[in-house]
């Protein structure tokens, strides 16, 4: 007959595993002794190996639950093509029987005592239940037996008292608007919400319990801009050293707007960041010397000659100046105290002259007195002799400029009855008053 052929036999459970297929003979399936077969689906699984006894099954339950009974177990001859020990064919069962005792004695029912008194009502107000109990001891059950029925019974009871209503909170109300519009000010901004003890309110008679917990909650506001912080001056810094070594100077103190620094649009510190003081060294300052104006040129002379006037003979002349006002170790005057030049003397020399053009108008004189006038002149100007403008006095020292010196006696044709100077005067018009400008400001 054809069988179902499997690739494995599971020793522990006696089951076929890994179905290869059906419609094959036992002989063909068992060409591989590791295989196993079933004659029908769900039937007994036989391995293809040579027959041997399976493990003993577990003991079956004891035939009775109390006092002495007996129990069975079995094993099976499994395999193909041969016999198990004792010349037993495959598929045969072998049994074992043993005595057993789950519980020595059998349970015996007990009997109830009479009912006890009713317990107080389960509540102190409105309606509840009350209970009474009885004991399973008349007689007591044996060997795990019990009494039939209930050990307690209950019935409704009415206290004839109205129950108090305990308070319960209603839901929280909305958060109030923030107590400030910015954070960092004198008061921390907070928002508040509250709830009422009204869901329900506690009863007055009989008195109910008030709501447990808190009715108000506060929390810090978030998302607010920082409050503006006005700037504050820090302390004045040290006075700077006097910047001068003599006379009066000016020292300075500085302070910084950082106590606190203005923040978040707060105003800058009012007032000045610096202040000055006069400092006095009590030391007079050095005064540098200054040259007076040059003195007059000395007469133009030539050594060893009595006079060179009105002659084409160069001479020499000098002028001096004085260094005045040097005090308290001030600098001496720079430069030469004496100036020397070469000259032609035309002192008192009669020279042909010519009238100059009109000079520009002079200043109005007197400037603050009555009837000021201005004047201009034409002068009889001498025509200087055509002497060489440079001379070489000492060989190797190069050419030196030569200057005409002295007051000649120019001769011009008479002009408007004058020989030397013709003057024209005019009054000054619309003359303003002389006033001290400082007094004018007052």
């Amino acid at each position: 007959d054809p069988v179902l052929c499997f690739t494995q036999y599971e020793e522990s459970s006696g089951k076929c595993k890994g179905l290869l297929g059906g419609g094959v003979s036992v002989e063909d399936c068992c060409l591989n002794t590791a295989f196993a077969y079933q004659k029908r689906s769900g039937g007994l699984c036989q391995p293809c190996r040579s027959p041997r006894w399976s493990l003993w099954s577990t003991w079956a339950p004891c035939s009775v639950t109390c006092s002495e009974g007996s129990q069975l177990r079995y094993r099976r001859c499994v395999g193909w093509n041969g016999q198990c020990s004792g010349k037993v064919a495959p598929g045969t069962l072998e049994w074992q029987l043993q005595a057993c005792e789950d519980q020595q004695c059998c349970p015996e029912m007990g009997g109830w005592s009479g009912w006890g008194p009713w317990e107080p009502c389960s509540v102190t107000c409105s309606k509840g239940t009350r209970t009474r109990r009885r004991a399973c001891n008349h007689p007591a059950p044996k060997c795990g037996g019990h009494c039939p029925g209930q050990a307690q019974e209950s019935e409704a009871c009415d206290t004839q008292q109205v129950c108090p209503t305990h308070g319960a909170w209603a839901t929280w109300g909305p958060w109030t608007p923030c107590s400030a519009s910015c954070h960092g000010g004198p008061h921390e901004p907070k928002e508040t919400r509250s709830r009422k003890c009204s869901a329900p309110e506690p009863s007055q008679k009989p008195p109910g319990k008030p709501c447990p917990g808190l009715a108000y909650e506060q929390r810090r506001c978030t998302g607010l801009p920082p409050c503006p912080v006005a700037g504050g001056w820090g302390p004045w810094g040290p006075v700077s050293p006097c910047p001068v070594t003599c006379g009066l100077g000016q020292t300075m103190e500085q302070r910084t707007c950082n106590h606190p620094v203005p923040q978040h649009g707060g105003p800058f510190c009012a007032g000045d960041a610096t202040r000055t003081h006069i400092c006095n060294t009590a030391v007079p300052c050095p005064v540098d010397g200054e040259w007076d104006s040059w003195g007059e040129w000395s007469p133009c002379i030539r050594r060893n000659m009595k006079s060179i006037s009105c002659q084409e003979i160069p001479g020499q002349q000098s002028r001096g100046r004085t260094c005045r006002g040097r005090k308290f170790d001030g600098h001496r005057c720079a430069g030469q105290q004496q100036d020397i030049r070469h000259c032609y003397s035309i002192q008192h020399c009669p020279l042909k002259g010519s009238w100059s053009e009109w000079s520009t108008w002079g200043l109005c004189m007197p400037p603050c007195g009555p009837n000021p006038t201005r004047a201009r002149q034409r002068l009889c100007t001498p025509l200087l002799p055509k002497y060489p403008p440079t001379v070489s006095m000492v060989e190797g020292q190069g050419e030196k400029n030569v200057t005409f010196w002295g007051r000649p006696l120019p001769r011009c044709e008479e002009l408007q009855g004058q020989k030397l100077v013709v003057e024209e005067k005019r009054p000054c018009l619309h003359v303003p008053a002389c006033k001290d400008p400082e007094e004018e400001e007052l």
């Epitope: 447990p212 917990g213 808190l214 909650e217 506060q218 929390r219 810090r220």
Partner: nanobody, 122 residues
Framework: QVHLVESGGGLVQAGGSLRLSCTAS????????VGWFRQAPGKERELIGV????????GYADSVLGRFTISRDDVKNTVFLQMDSVKPEDTAVYYC???????????????WGQGTQVTVSG
């Protein structure tokens, strides 16, 4: 184990002010929400206020709102109850207590102080 000690109680005139302190030792008060309770003679212990761990949230009972303020100074390891405009009915033993989580309900607190007496004379 946090040990809480209340101080600052005493006798005060009605309308006056008092500041109670709750100082922690053996732990950091900044790790806990702190509640203030009071118990008047013959009455149940009442929760009157609570402050959260970071001080961002506070809760108050109806009876003290606007008069009492709770604040905390974690550097000093102390929580304060500032009592202003006190009334004779504020007479009680005041307790502070600490728990891990902030709640404005009546919930169990893990650590309790021994209490400080406040008496308001009429």
């Amino acid at each position: 184990q946090v040990h809480l000690v209340e101080s600052g109680g005493g006798l005060v005139q009605a309308g006056g002010s008092l500041r109670l302190s709750c100082t922690a030792s053996g732990g950091t008060v900044g790790d806990y929400a702190v509640g203030w309770f009071r118990q008047a003679p013959g009455k149940e212990r009442e929760l009157i206020g609570v402050v959260s761990r970071l001080g961002a949230r506070t809760g108050y009972a109806d009876s003290v709102l606007g008069r009492f303020t709770i604040s905390r100074d974690d550097v000093k390891n102390t929580v304060f109850l500032q009592m202003d405009s006190v009334k004779p009915e504020d007479t009680a033993v005041y307790y502070c207590a600490a728990r891990r989580d902030y709640s404005f309900e009546v919930v169990p607190y893990d650590y309790w102080g021994q209490g400080t007496q406040v008496t308001v004379s009429g």
